[in-house]
């Protein structure tokens, strides 16, 4: 079943309330390396994209590292996920209010198309963690995210035993898995070219549609 | 460089106890469990038990329940196996493991041969 | 019961494929994990989890699974891989590990 967006009737082409997010999107030049795809269209600045690229950013202060060094191949999906979070102004359908310090609003089950959330898994199951939700449960007293303490650093397949459970669990299922593939129109990618455009917007627009006609039926 | 280097070979009477110890340098050492495995002499290699260095929580195998006890030290980044009630059928390598998931051993100590001799 | 079987030595030609399997109950709700031990040494994981290789295992060993049963392949066999080869799995009841009995490999 597909739940609407919240109180929102402008599903297509905004920002997300959060900590970094732009108010209204638009062409951004200067995005910085992978988060440049939404150079033309965007709900981040070049200064969030350049940060987000660092370890340890002073985004959200997180470390990617917290058991030992994530390999670059492993990294370089949590990167292209932060640009797709700060950065998408295609996300709209999928928005929900949240009460949290840091943001008013989150995505909630976001559906990735299957091959970005197999990929994302098969090149990250033998880097280490010690969670499978990276949302909670973290200690932050030195201001980074550590491990709890006795949360034992294990392999990520150890922790996320399949795709879905990696791309659903790990934000508290901001993502769930499609059934859809790439370039199909029915799922979210993480990775696009944009020499081709966009294609997260006619994903948006199918999603937002859909919706609109799930309240109407609901209205009668 | 992930390094666990083990204590010296041990001579030990029947009825005696020896404690075998695993200092690891180059990684967390609260952040892994470390297991214990020992092979006899031409024999098969068997799992002693783990301990979880970040809390101290321990499991030890059905066959050494009772006489085996796995203990750290944080502050030395070290893990310690003694073994009581000594008996001939113990002489063996004693070998300490990092687990990085659930039983996958990838970083070995060198070993520590133990004697058990009248 | 928790036991791991694995067949006590196994031969193969240089340059062949030779399949080492093992056994047990416990495989058929975990992985089994593959260590290769030469004599006076310690033991050196060799695959684990799903057929995963840590750096500097060389390709031709992968792993694979069905059932109760694991198996380690090593495709073109060298000289530097005779070596006695344990499975080891997770036994969920209790998070205790139980090893295999080892199997011996000879290349010919």
């Known amino acids: 079943t597909m739940c609407s967006a919240q109180d929102r009737t402008d599903l297509l082409n905004v920002c997300m309330d959060a900590k970094h997010h732009k108010t209204k999107p638009g062409p951004e030049d200067k995005l910085h390396d992978q988060c440049s795809p939404w150079k033309k269209n965007a709900c981040c600045t070049a200064s969030t994209s350049q940060e987000l690229h660092k370890d340890t950013s002073r985004l959200y202060n997180f470390n990617w590292d917290h058991c030992g060094k994530m390999e670059p191949a492993c990294k370089r999906h949590f990167i292209q996920d932060t640009c797709l979070y700060e950065c998408s102004p295609n996300l709209g359908p999928w928005i929900q209010q949240v009460n949290q310090s840091w943001r008013k609003e989150r995505f909630l089950d976001v559906p990735l198309c299957k091959e970005d959330c197999q990929r994302w898994w098969e090149d990250c199951h033998t880097s280490h963690t010690c969670k499978s939700n990276w949302h909670r449960g973290w200690d932050w007293t030195s201001g980074v995210n550590k491990c709890p303490a006795g949360a034992l650093c294990r392999t990520f397949e150890s922790y996320f035993p399949t795709p879905a459970a990696l791309c659903e669990g790990l934000w508290s299922h901001s993502y769930k898995v499609s059934n859809y593939s790439r370039g199909s129109g029915r799922c979210i990618q993480m990775w696009f070219d944009s020499a081709q455009g966009n294609p997260n917007e006619e994903v948006a627009r199918f999603y937002a549609a859909a919706m609109h006609v799930n309240a109407g039926e609901m209205l009668h | 460089e992930v390094q666990l280097v083990q204590s010296g070979a041990e001579v030990k009477k029947p009825g005696a106890s020896v404690k075998v110890s695993c200092k690891a340098s180059?990684?967390?050492?609260?952040?892994?469990?470390m297991h214990w495995v020992r092979q006899a002499p031409g024999q098969r290699l068997e799992w002693m038990g783990w301990i979880n260095a970040g809390n101290g929580n321990t499991k030890y195998s059905q066959k050494f329940q009772g006489r085996v006890t796995i203990t750290r030290d944080t502050s030395a980044s070290t893990a310690y196996m003694e073994l009581s009630s000594l008996r001939s059928e113990d002489t063996a390598v004693y070998y300490c493991a990092r687990d990085i998931s659930y039983g996958s051993f990838d970083y070995w100590g060198q070993g520590t041969l133990v004697t058990v001799s009248s | 019961s928790s036991e791991l079987t694995q067949d006590p030595a196994v031969s193969v030609a240089l340059g062949q494929t030779v399949r080492i399997t093992c056994q047990g109950d416990?495989?058929?709700?975990?992985?089994a994990n593959w260590y290769q031990q030469k004599p006076g040494q310690a033991p050196v994981l060799v695959i684990y989890g799903q057929n995963n290789r840590p750096s500097g295992i060389p390709d031709r060993f992968s792993g694979s699974s069905s059932g109760n049963t694991a198996s380690l392949t090593i495709t073109g066999a060298q000289a530097a891989d005779e070596a006695d080869y344990y499975c080891d799995s997770r036994v969920s009841t209790g998070n205790h590990v139980v090893f295999g009995g080892g199997t011996k490999l000879t290349v010919l």
């Open positions: 180059g990684y967390t050492f609260t952040s892994y469990a």
């Open positions: 416990s495989l058929r709700s975990n992985y």
